[in-house]
Interface confidence: low
């Protein structure tokens, strides 16, 4: 009977421990379910954020493209409304560009044409004064749009008009005959005849955009 | 004895159940810890995404403002006249004039001021590239708006801002002291220190007129 009581007491203890453990398991199960729910919510939140981020990236890309387009338009419109494009000098009715590369006459002519311009044409002493001033700090020669096939031909501008004799005197190799023709360059305010095949800087010229702004 | 045996059997069962439950609790505890870790990771991921989203929003706001500004500028530029006066070169936001006379630094500064301009200021390598190109066909020196009282003073632009050291190295008489101060000129793409009293060509600069008329 004493053994029996002792066993009963142990059994009661074990039953109590078992109930307690079962309670703990139940609590943990609930916590686990809540945690799972919380985790699902977090995952949902991540999905939402990732989607929003993706959308924002798309919007940003779109804005960036809009920006680039606006900048492009701005460049074009600015060029349209200005008398001359960027890097050109506006003087009276013309725009002038002093080349930064050195090429033969024909190549220089092509470069000007690609910029919707022609090589320099001097129509008046005022034009000549401006050009002489503009290149006063350079010791280099600049091709202009004046050439002739050989010494028996007249000096002609690119548009086919003849050189007005009172404008300037052409110095240098005026009586030389070159296979590529004779071309005129301006250097330190004086105009010289030279072999068109030689490399020199050049001056491009085009009409200034003086339409109503 | 039969009761005793029965109790012992029940006790064995209970002990077995208790051990099983304890095992389950231990397993759940580990799972809970792993779940907690996973939750922490998810929270971190959320924080990162939220930060990224915030940054993107800021960037987008900035782009949006840029867009509005560009649209505004576009409206203004569309009905604006010449960005620069005659004989000046328009490049980006500025107008540049290459002097045709040779004067000391102070006189050159006065000449620019009389034209509502200042002596050249180089803010970036892009500015420097443009100026180097523009004077590439000249062997002459051009004053710029950079000077200092003596070698213990910093190089300052006319507006009082200091020279950014990465832009270019100043050569020549950098350690000389002159009564009129030391001024900087640009020649063939390099910048030199010189006595401000010497005469040189100069480059004037002013903001291009991109405002509405």
């Amino acid at each position: 009977s004493q053994v029996s009581n002792l066993l009963k007491q142990q059994q009661t203890n074990l039953t109590h421990q078992k109930n307690k453990l079962e309670g703990q398991i139940s609590a943990r199960q609930q916590a686990e379910e809540a945690s799972q729910e919380s985790q699902n919510e977090l995952k949902e939140m991540i999905e939402t954020l990732a989607w929003k981020l993706n959308e924002k990236s798309k919007e940003q890309m779109e804005l960036h493209h809009q920006n680039l387009n606006l900048q492009e338009t701005l460049k074009r419109v600015a060029n349209c409304s200005a008398p001359c494009p960027q890097d050109w000098i506006w003087h009276e009715e013309n725009c002038y560009l002093f080349s930064t590369g050195s090429f033969n006459w024909e190549k220089s002519q092509e470069k000007c044409l690609s910029l919707d311009a022609k090589l320099l044409k001097i129509n008046s002493t005022a034009d000549l004064d401006f050009i002489q001033q503009a290149i006063s700090y350079s010791s280099f020669p600049f091709w202009m749009g004046l050439s002739r096939r050989n010494p028996s031909y007249p000096w002609l501008w690119e548009d086919g008009s003849p050189l007005m004799p009172h404008l300037f005197r052409i110095r240098g190799a005026v009586s030389q005959t070159y296979p590529s023709g004779t071309c005129a360059y301006i250097q330190r305010g004086a105009v010289y005849a030279e072999n068109c095949i030689l490399a020199a800087f050049s001056i491009c010229q085009k009409k200034a955009n003086l339409r109503a702004q | 004895s039969q009761v005793s045996n029965l109790l012992k059997q029940q006790q064995t069962n209970l002990t077995h159940q208790k051990n099983k439950l304890e095992g389950q609790i231990s397993a759940r505890q580990q799972a809970e810890e792993a779940s907690q870790e996973s939750q922490n990771e998810l929270k971190e991921m959320i924080e990162t995404l939220a930060w990224k989203l915030n940054e993107k929003s800021k960037e987008q706001m900035e782009l949006h403002h840029q867009n509005l500004n560009l649209q505004e500028t576009l409206k203004r530029v569309a009905n604006c006249s010449a960005p620069c006066p005659q004989d000046w070169i328009w490049h980006e936001e500025n107008c540049y004039l290459f002097s045709t006379g040779s004067f000391n630094w102070e006189k050159s500064q006065e000449k620019c001021l009389s034209l509502d301009a200042k002596l050249l200021k180089i803010n970036s390598t892009a500015d420097l590239d443009f100026i180097q190109q523009a004077i590439s066909y000249s062997s002459f020196p051009f004053w710029m708006g950079l000077s200092r009282r003596n070698p213990s003073y910093p190089w300052l632009w006319e507006d009082g801002s200091p020279l950014m050291p990465h832009l270019f190295r100043i050569r020549g008489a950098v350690s000389q002291t002159y009564p009129s101060g030391t001024c900087a000129y640009i020649q063939r793409g390099a910048v030199y220190a010189e006595n401000c009293i010497l005469a040189a060509f100069s480059i004037c600069q002013k903001k291009a007129n991109l405002r509405a008329q």
């Epitope: 930064t100 050195s102 490399a199 | 066909y137 020196p141 006595n195 010497l198």
Partner: antibody, heavy 115, light 107 residues
């Protein structure tokens, strides 16, 4: 450091041509003009002309136009001066020198025109 | 063209003495003047640019002065290695022209 290495002495017949070279070392060849100077006991130092290797643009004194041709080879960082239709007047030492003021000089090339 | 004139072709000076070499331009050259030293068998060497700025490595006994059309190269405490011919050059405008040179000798 900066060095200009010129080609060796030349003995040439009257009427012939000669091409002198000047190799640039120690700096960016295209950044600086290369000038050429003639030296004789009678006329001293005379500037002939200059070439801008970056652009190929050249400038000559009137006296040497048609006599001297300046070229620059960017790939080898070498400047050349060709002298044509040589006469005894062209006998001299020719120097290549870097920009203005002339901060670096080649060692000089002696050209003797003789039959 | 701008002519550069060095009035003395020869100068004879005692060791340790002071020498002044003059150079006159036919027009104003705004201080764009260089001085060169040439020793027999060698190429010229740049001493001074901008009329007054001493080049790196040039002894401080050399100095330059002047303005407008008139310029001077001075050497104080003359040393044997200073025996050479000295040339001035204007580099304001092409053609860049040199003076005829002044040959310096020791007395």
């Amino acid at each position: 450091q900066v060095q200009l290495q010129q080609s060796g002495a030349e003995l040439v017949r009257p009427g012939a041509s000669v091409k002198l070279s000047c190799k640039a070392l120690g700096y960016t060849f295209t950044d600086y003009e290369m000038h050429w100077v003639k030296q004789t006991p009678v006329h001293g130092l005379e500037w002939i002309g200059a070439i801008h290797p970056g652009s190929g643009g050249a400038a000559y004194i009137q006296k040497f136009k048609g006599k001297a041709t300046l070229t620059a080879d960017k790939s080898s960082s070498t400047a050349h001066m060709e002298l044509s239709s040589l006469t005894s007047e062209d006998s001299a030492v020719y120097y290549c020198t870097r920009w203005l003021p002339m901060d670096y000089w080649g060692q000089g090339t002696s050209v003797t025109v003789s039959s | 063209d701008i002519q550069m004139t060095q009035s003395s072709s020869y100068l004879s000076v005692s060791l340790g003495g002071r020498v002044t070499i003059t150079c006159k331009a036919s027009d104003h050259i705004n201080n764009w003047l260089a001085w060169y030293q040439q020793k027999p068998g060698n190429a010229p060497r740049l001493l001074i640019s901008g009329a007054t700025s001493l080049e790196t490595g040039v002894p401080s006994r050399f100095s330059g002065s002047g303005s407008g059309k008139d310029y001077t190269l001075s050497i104080t405490g003359l040393q044997t290695e200073d025996v050479a011919t000295y040339y001035c050059q204007q580099y304001l405008i092409t053609p860049y022209t040199f003076g005829g040179g002044t040959k310096l000798e020791i007395k």
